[in-house]
Amino acid sequence: MMTGTIETTGNISAEKGGSIILQCHLSSTTAQVTQVNWEQQDQLLAICNADLGWHISPSFKDRVAPGPGLGLTLQSLTVNDTGEYFCIYHTYPDGTYTGRIFLEVLESSVAEHGARFQIP
């Protein structure tokens, strides 16, 4: 039975040219995290595997940095980076948990963090 919940940084905004940390946290379960995928709807950004370490997709290598922790840092942001990001936690024995973050990249300096939210 899956008892865990994913807490994410929720809806966030950042300035064009800046950087942002995408962060998820799995709680309320003793399941072992064996892999975390960072994805957009149509492409994989990065994977952190407990045995193999980090893998960054070649199309993001220049501006994605692993961490902190199981999170992901996006750099040199463009307006095209606006959209949904998913953290997919592969766990044993629970299975797969997913969190969602919506990032808006702004032209001006009005970027500020939104509220936190949970996906069960």
């Epitope: 995928n37 709807q41 149509d42 492409q43 994989l44 994977i47 997709s57 199309s59 997919i88 797969t96």
Partner: antibody, heavy 118, light 107 residues
Framework: QVQLQESGPGLVKPSQTLSLTCTVS?????????WNWIRQPPGKGLEWIGY???????RYNPSLKSRVTISVDTSKNQFSLKLSSVTAADTAVYYC???????????WGQGTLVTVSS | DIQMTQSPSSLSASVGDRVTITCKAS??????VAWYQQKPGKAPKLLIY???YRYTGVPSRFSGSGSGTDFTLTISSLQPEDFATYYC?????????FGQGTRLEIK
């Protein structure tokens, strides 16, 4: 439990437009996920055609992009495939499928055979 | 596009046998590979995702392994209901692509 069901003509003439609909039950297609079309020519492998996401964004296979349109009818909880200028090479079983965030496909319709022939 | 090449294309085996099907990607896909089982006239069924994670309800005799470009689906002890065609799929980048299939037949 989500269920998907394809429907549409089983026979299309060459140069015409193939039109199929996928009716989804047990889940609102505007709530989440991406809704895909995948095809399989007789006796051959699977080919991903494209998707429409719950928010209306589309992504198509570049090999078919110039001929493909995927759209949604929210009132009927359906999404549709249109493939223009068909030839015999488009004869296939067409499946609709729901993608997981990680881009694997846990949920499929039963498939519908479309034959392109005059 | 990333090409997925399966081998063998067909395989004969007996109930109780251990069977291995391989899939080779044309470029590094890390662990982003899924496996499906398809029976005649039916839709594919998801068995494995992210190279080694069994989907809900899939029997433990099915296992996946591999990373980079080389992946394996293993059935530890074939059951009568396992005779089918198996496909690998890369879920690394669009367009998502499938192998050509491996047909598993009764010997």
């Amino acid at each position: 439990q989500v269920q998907l069901q394809e429907s549409g003509p089983g026979l299309v003439k060459p140069s015409q437009t193939l039109s199929l609909t996928c009716t989804v039950s047990g889940y609102s297609i505007t709530s989440d996920y991406a809704w895909n079309w995948i095809r399989q020519p007789p006796g051959k492998g699977l080919e991903w055609i494209g998707y429409i996401s719950y928010s209306g964004n589309t992504r198509y296979n570049p090999s078919l992009k110039s001929r493909v349109t995927i759209s949604v009818d929210t009132s009927k909880n359906q999404f549709s495939l249109k493939l223009s200028s068909v030839t015999a090479a488009d004869t296939a079983v067409y499946y609709c499928a729901r993608k997981y965030y990680g881009s694997w496909f846990p949920y499929w319709g039963q498939g519908t055979l479309v034959t392109v022939s005059s | 596009d990333i090409q997925m090449t399966q081998s063998p294309s067909s395989l004969s085996a007996s109930v109780g046998d251990r069977v291995t099907i391989t899939c080779k990607a044309s470029q590094d896909v890390f662990t982003a590979v899924a496996w499906y089982q398809q029976k005649p006239g039916k839709a594919p069924k998801l068995l494995i995702y992210s190279a080694s994670y069994r989907y809900t309800g899939v029997p433990s005799r099915f296992s996946g392994s591999g990373s980079g470009t080389d992946f394996t689906l293993t059935i530890s002890s074939l059951q009568p209901e396992d005779f089918a065609t198996y496909y690998c799929q890369q879920h690394y980048s669009t367009p998502w692509t499938f192998g050509q299939g491996t047909r598993l037949e009764i010997k």
